[in-house]
Amino acid sequence: EPPTACREKQYLINSQCCSLCQPGQKLVSDCTEFTETECLPCGESEFLDTWNRETHCHQHKYCDPNLGLRVQQKGTSETDTICTCEEGWHCTSEACESCVLHRSCSPGFGVKQIATGVSDTICEPCPVGFFSNVSSAFEKCHPWTSCETKDLVVQQAGTNKTDVVCGPQDRLR
């Protein structure tokens, strides 16, 4: 009886089970009752990453420097090229097809997590007792100056954008 299902790494064609081509190889011709599936290695700059019956290999991804991309990991016959972004930029998607400049955290916000090649800067509002007076992709919220430890007193209260202003204590005459 002709098979209706095939084993793993096989496919059904013309009522018979043929071996799939291994990763890194493409299908040249299906098997017959006399011959096994004929496969050929993918060419330079091509890949196939699964057991397959593809007649064409996929082209390696091109990391376009004009889009801020660079090669993070060179592709092989079995894997695609992995792109990442140049310093100061990050990917716009998981596929990393283009890059955008890391965002800066505005005054009143500090950097919670510094950007990577694949994720943007994460900002957080400076809580009470902390401030940020610059727009930065690296600066965290800084704690207000402690006037007491300097034997000074607060002359002007701090905000999320400004530090406290310390001044000398009033002396009794």
Partner: antibody, heavy 117, light 107 residues
Framework: EVQLVESGGGVVQPGRSLRLSCAAS????????MSWVRQAPGKGLEWVAS????????YYPDNVKGRFTISRDNSKNTLYLQMNSLRAEDTAVYYC??????????WGQGTLVTVSS | EIVLTQSPATLSLSPGERATLSCRAS??????LHWYQQKPGQAPRLLIY???QSISGIPARFSGSGSGTDFTLTISSLEPEDFAVYYC?????????FGQGTKVEIK
């Protein structure tokens, strides 16, 4: 018991034709691909032709393509090889073989074809 | 066309000795190779399939190995009935091709 019995061999003049037959028994003939393999005197084995179990697909090496035709009659459990335009270099013992697991798992005893003037 | 080259052409050994026969393919054929034995005046018979798979009814002293381009048929201890010609055959692609054979003869 699987049996393959070839017949139809003999002496033939160059340019003439000959038809070989192979009678199969002991297995379900229509489930198996079949092939012809030949062996020139004192030489090695050479594949000549193959035919799929249903008879729809045939395969030949370049040196016999267009001259030889493989066919089968599943109702008669018989394999054929029609050989036309025979040449001296076609002189050989012709074996009928069954394709099991992509191997030639059973062979007949062969029939001798001599092409000579 | 895939060319199979067998070596040596002739192997002279005594009964009880180990025989190692080689078959080299002109390009990778994965494990798509069979071995056959032919005794004088007889039809060939299948010994090993898919390079290393044993056949029911074939003595365990016959074994095959290899993948890609280099294959070996080993007869662990030669018996008098093992002196014959051995052929490898590829079924990776058309046309089906055989090696030229290795003759194992009594020394």
């Amino acid at each position: 018991e699987v049996q393959l019995v070839e017949s139809g061999g003999g002496v033939v003049q160059p340019g003439r034709s000959l038809r070989l037959s192979c009678a199969a028994s002991g297995f379900t003939f229509s489930n198996y691909g079949m092939s012809w393999v030949r062996q020139a005197p004192g030489k090695g084995l050479e594949w000549v032709a193959s035919i799929s179990s249903g008879g729809d697909d045939t395969y030949y090496p370049d040196n016999v393509k267009g001259r030889f035709t493989i066919s089968r009659d599943n109702s008669k459990n018989t394999l054929y090889l029609q050989m036309n335009s025979l040449r001296a270099e076609d002189t050989a013992v012709y074996y009928c073989t069954r394709a099991g697991g992509k191997a030639m798992d059973y062979w007949g005893q062969g029939t001798l074809v001599t092409v000579s003037s | 066309e895939i060319v199979l080259t067998q070596s040596p052409a002739t192997l002279s050994l005594s009964p009880g000795e180990r025989a190692t026969l080689s078959c080299r393919a002109s390009q990778s054929i994965r494990d798509n190779l069979h071995w056959y034995q032919q005794k004088p005046g007889q039809a060939p018979r299948l010994l090993i399939y898919y390079a290393s798979q044993s056949i029911s009814g074939i003595p365990a002293r016959f074994s095959g190995s290899g993948s890609g381009t280099d294959f070996t048929l080993t007869i662990s201890s030669l018996e008098p009935e093992d002196f014959a010609v051995y052929y490898c055959q590829q079924f990776n692609s058309w046309p089906l091709t055989f090696g030229q054979g290795t003759k194992v003869e009594i020394k």
